[in-house]
């Protein structure tokens, strides 16, 4: 706490200048005026003010705005941005996509803070969903952003902001996020032919049922194995060894590597050795000739 | 009263080093922002560094940059200039200056009597 | 960079008279200049700061004035201390720039 003194003489502040470097904190405190502050926010950012300096400024207008500041002083906050805690930025009603810019631009190059995921949490709760726009200047800041959503908060994505996705931004999605955006990802890409279609939906495909891999597996489209590991396993298993074939073109070779990882592994031990044996890849483990294999959940469901 | 005491100038080869110093008394040092000026002989002045009371922000010349490191011991009362990569163009004399300030205006108001550098072969 | 210009060079005036420096800012400069006299043999001295405002000691014969790019340092009547270089100085952009100085001397 800077503990209020008189301003010295010819030293009193009126605009924000690059000479107020050289005041002390209780110098700030005293000479600098927080509406003054309030109005010139810009110019503080063109200052090199040291951290314990920006503490003044920030108490300043933290007493000028108790509420929480108004998007105006927001917007041009600049560095000042990374001395906010998440307390102070749940007092904020962030309405404007270009003060988010302005602000993400300050933390660029900087992990996810604390205060920039609140900043965005509470920016998306004011806008009531994350429409195009939002979603692609956040993965432009944070290409992770979307797999740090839980599958609740994605289910808010309109299929309309899928177009903003790039296929890093999903990289690390879980199976349950996958899910949540597949249905979003078809819809969106739905009016585009086989082969356009394949490279926008083939990112989101962690998420796919079987019978949408059957229906890709009819449209030659030469799935590579990078995008074959990471189908959901339930959906991979009834694919028949045709199937497989058709969905990886030239790229089935690749199974062999991959025989021991899942999904591959467990696909290998509902297939028939036979079928396998097709593929002319020496993938062992299928189920050998003569032996019936009973669905059982499909008897359970049929009692 | 306030002095100002430089030290440590004298005759380097270009490519060399050398550290200046600057011995402070009469005010409370560790208050005042501090500066390195110099002067070639029988030119003007030109100023080559600044430092915050507290170090916490330096400035420099672009004429200086990269190769002069200014910095202070305020327990010690002193300000320091490091000079290395030495051309022929450094030979000044070089004064060790207080900052003060008001409103918009930022000047020097008490000055050392200077210590002659020389950079030659 | 601002480049500050001083004019005249040299002035060349006798004991008594009144003695008009100029400084020219390169643009409008928001700061206030500082002016400095400088004898032969000697450091800097401070005379001015804030444009208009004398430094402590220094006589009252020295004024200055001027804002924006045109800066005057008026020596109402010269004392033969007088004679010597006077340099103006401006702080911007986080950098200091100084005149390359005015020499009154004895005419």
């Known amino acids: 706490e800077v503990e209020k003194t008189a301003c010295p003489s010819g030293k009193k502040a009126r605009e924000i200048d690059e000479s107020l470097i050289f005041y002390k904190k209780w110098e700030l405190e005293a000479c600098v005026d927080a509406a003054l502050l309030a109005t010139q926010m810009d110019r503080v950012n063109a200052i090199p003010f040291t951290y314990e300096q920006l503490d003044v400024l920030k108490h300043k207008l933290d007493e000028l705005y108790p509420q929480g500041y108004p998007e105006s002083v927001i917007q041009h906050l600049g560095y000042l941005f990374l001395k906010m805690s998440p307390e102070d930025i749940r007092k904020w009603n962030v309405t404007s996509l270009e003060t988010l810019k302005a602000l993400l631009e300050v933390n660029k190059g900087h992990e996810m803070s604390p205060q920039v995921a609140t900043l965005i949490d509470r920016f998306v709760k004011g806008r009531g969903q994350l429409d195009k726009d939002t979603l692609d200047t956040l993965t432009a800041f944070y290409p992770g952003y979307l797999c740090s959503l839980s599958p609740e908060e994605l289910s808010s994505v309109p299929p309309s902001s899928i177009w903003a996705v790039r296929p890093q931004d999903l990289d690390t999605c879980d199976p349950r996020q996958l899910d949540v955006l597949y249905p979003k990802a078809r819809l969106a890409f739905q009016n585009m032919n086989g082969s356009e279609y394949f490279v926008k939906i083939q990112s989101f495909l962690g998420g796919a049922p079987t019978e949408d891999l059957k229906a890709l597996s009819q449209q030659n489209v030469s799935m590579d194995l990078a995008t074959f590991m990471k189908l959901r396993t339930d959906a991979v298993l009834p694919l028949t060894v045709a199937e497989v074939q058709k969905l990886l073109g030239p790229h089935v070779e690749g199974l062999k590597a991959e025989e021991r990882h899942r999904p591959v592994r467990d696909w290998i031990l509902r297939q028939r050795q036979d079928d396998l044996d097709t593929l002319g890849l020496g993938l062992q483990g299928g189920i050998p000739n003569g032996y019936l294999v009973l669905d059982l959940s499909m008897q359970e469901a049929l009692s | 009263q306030v002095q100002l005491v430089e030290s440590g100038g004298g005759l380097v080869q270009p490519g060399g080093s050398l550290r200046l110093s600057c011995a402070a008394s009469?005010?409370?040092?560790?208050?005042?922002?501090m500066s390195w000026v110099r002067q070639a002989p029988g030119k003007g002045l030109e100023w080559v560094s600044a430092?915050?009371?507290?170090?916490?922000?330096?400035f420099y010349a672009d004429s200086v940059k990269g190769r002069f490191t200014i910095s202070r011991d305020n327990s010690k009362n002193t300000l320091y200039l490091q000079m290395n990569s030495l051309r022929a163009e450094d030979t000044a004399v070089y004064y060790c200056?207080?900052?003060?300030?008001?409103?918009?205006?930022?000047?020097?108001?008490?000055w050392g009597q200077g210590t002659l550098v020389t950079v030659s072969s | 960079d601002i480049v500050l210009t001083q004019s005249p060079a040299t002035l060349s005036l006798s004991p008594g008279e009144r003695a008009t420096l100029s400084c020219r800012a390169s643009?409008?400069?928001?700061?206030?200049l500082a002016w400095y006299q400088q004898k032969p043999g000697q450091a800097p001295r401070l005379l001015i700061y804030?444009?208009?405002s004398r430094a402590t000691g220094v006589p009252a014969r020295f004024s200055g004035s001027g804002s924006g790019t045109d800066f005057t340092l008026t020596i109402s009547s010269l004392e033969p201390e007088d004679f010597a270089t006077y340099y103006c100085q401006q702080y911007y952009n986080f950098s200091f720039t100084f005149g390359q100085g005015t020499k009154v001397e004895i005419k």
């Open positions: 009469g005010f409370t040092f560790s208050d005042y922002a």
């Open positions: 643009q409008i400069v928001s700061g206030y």
């Open positions: 804030g444009a208009s």
């Open positions: 200056a207080r900052i003060n300030y008001i409103y918009k205006g930022v000047h020097f108001d008490y």
């Open positions: 430092i915050m009371y507290d170090s916490s922000s330096t």
